[in-house]
Each structure stands twice: as structure tokens, then as C-alpha cells.
Amino acid sequence: PEPPTACREKQYLINSQCCSLCQPGQKLVSDCTEFTETECLPCGESEFLDTWNRETHCHQHKYCDPNLGLRVQQKGTSETDTICTCEEGWHCTSEACESCVLHRSCSPGFGVKQIATGVSDTICEPCPVGFFSNVSSAFEKCHPWTSCETKDLVVQQAGTNKTDVVCGPQDRLRA
């Protein structure tokens, strides 16, 4: 018979013959021959292959590097890679989450508009007139200036976007 020019799914062509691919979780040891089947071997500890393949080496599981703010979300198997995610207080630098960075803090004069998540950073906004923030924080919103009037006090020092107003006693009118 004519040697094949194409093979079925889960097969590959070698030496004019169709050999079975190795299943996920296994690597190729030797190609099939006219008389023998493809020889495959399971991937070792901390290795994987996630497709039908003819790879002679398994891939190492991804290392979730704590130096990059990463931790293991899901441990890898012989057929799947390890999935990493960010440590608490960190967020991914891209959709693929290959590394993480610490959430940004909002500087004094700015408040948190949106608290960071594992995939998005802190969103800051400038404190508008009547509000202030005197700390660098990843959680604190802008606070409203103290209302001196409700305490029967008067404004002694005006507030800014970084400082609260300073209240003081009303001047007593002497008889």
C-alpha cells in the first residue's frame, strides 16, 4: 500500500507511517515502528503536558514567584499547569497575571474612589472643596470637613484638600 501523506486525529506522520500521539500527561519515549506502538511515559512530579503530543520533554509547572507577588491559586497536575494569582494587597499587571504589584495608595489630598481588586489597581480622586485626606492610603476616602456650626463653634482655620478645618469657640460679646 501507498505510504500515508496525512494521519488521523491524535496521530502524527513519521518515517512514512502514522504513529499515535502521546496523551496529555505523558511524553514521547520512542516513535512507533511497523511492529511496535508509540512508547510514552508519564510526566514526572512538577511536570505537565496539556495536549496530545510528541514532546520528548514535559514542561515544568509554572513557579508562582512570591518576589513577583504571586501565589498558587491551583496546583498543577500531569495534564495541567499551575495557576498563579496575586497575594492579598497586590494586583495583576495584565490579564494573563504573569506578575503582580502592590496596590497603589492615594496620596494626601486624594481619596480612594475605587478600592483595588486582584486584577485592578486603586483608583484615586482629588478631594473636592469641602473634603480632605491627610493620609496616604489604599482604602480611605476623602472625608468631609468638620462642620463647626453643628458644634456651636466657628472656623478658626480654613480647611484644604489635605487638612480639616480648625474649629474654635465663638467670640463672646462683652456687655
Epitope: 495584565s94 490579564e95 494573563a96
Partner: antibody, heavy 116, light 108 residues
Amino acid sequence: EVTLKESGPVLVKPTETLTLTCTVSGFSLSSYGVSWIRQPPGKALEWLAGIGSDGSAYYASWAKSRLTISRDTNLKQVVLTMTNMDPVDTATYYCARGGITVYAMWGQGTLVTVSS
Amino acid sequence: AFQLTQSPSSLSASVGDRVTITCQASQSISTGLAWYQQKPGKPPKLLIVGASNLASGVPSRFSGSGSGTDFTLTISSLQPEDFATYYCQSYFSSSSTVFGGGTKVEIK
């Protein structure tokens, strides 16, 4: 063993399109991204583009209109095309493992000269 | 556009000297900064990740510090093999993935 190897033309003419291929081994493109970084002779490194393990493509803003990055996970290749080449694009072009991240693994680089 | 400004662009030092290189980002990048060493004709070698963490196999004389916009690479006691060019790199986001202009460390 993790390896990355760049291939493509060593000489291109001005206005031509450059196509570079990065062939990887020892890791899966479904697990790691790949970026292209270049270095003109005697000058600094310049990040050009990256493709994440999820297939997302990212480009340097200054070169976005000229670049396309793509991958073939089965062939284990990442391809960068750069249109309208100019002599100032003469550089060593590196591919490195990683998308938007740090780059611990690099290819040896390929020098591309743009000249008529 | 986002920028990383590295200084100095070059410096001369002797073996045993303490060397400091700075990198300034045009906007906050939190801890998303790496440092590399490059020797002529070779690809860069990763030294520091996350602004202050030593990459695998890097000698402890190298250290990094900083967060936000200002970062520093320090070599506590310069060795003969440390004469090279050093680059900072931001990886905070896709729009801020950039290399600094480099610092060439030469023998005095």
C-alpha cells in the same frame, strides 16, 4: 531546558516589512507570554510588544501602528511584524519569555540592518 | 507618555566602591520595577524584581529599593565582573512597560 531563538532576515530595505520569528522550547505558550525587545547599536533597550499566555497582545505606544504580534502555540512560535522599516530601526532584536512582567529568559538576539 | 529616567548615564568607579544608580518614573508604578545587567554582545540578565527582591542566583552585593516613582539600585562593593551597563524596567501595566536609558559602569 528553556530556550528562545530569534530568526529572520539580517538585511531589509527601507519601507519594507520586517518579519521576525521567536521559536521557543521547554515551556508552553499557553503558560507564558513572550515579548520583543530591541537595542539599536550602542543604545538602550526598547520594549516593542508582548503577547500574554492568554493571547492578549500589547504594544509600545510609540510604535503601535507599525507592529503586529501573533503566536502559534502548536509550532511554539511568536511572530513580530514591523512595517515601513527605516535605517533607524537597525538594531539587535531580542525575544524574551514573559508578557507584561520581568524577563528572566532571553534569546541571543538577531541583528537586523535596514539599508538600501 | 510614560517615561523612566535613569541617572547617571555613565559613571566611573573602582573595585570595592559602593555604586548607586537611580531610576525615576513619570507616574507611580508601585513596586513594578526590575533591574538588569548587560554586558557587550549579550542579552540582559535579570537582577532585581518587585523593586527590591533579588532574582535567583544574583549576588547579595546587589540591592534595590524604592516604590512609587523613585527607585535605586545599589552595588555595595563593586567587583571586576560588575563593570557593565544597567537598565531599569517598569512592568506596572502594558502602557508603562518601558526600559530606562541605561547606566554604563566603567573602571576608573
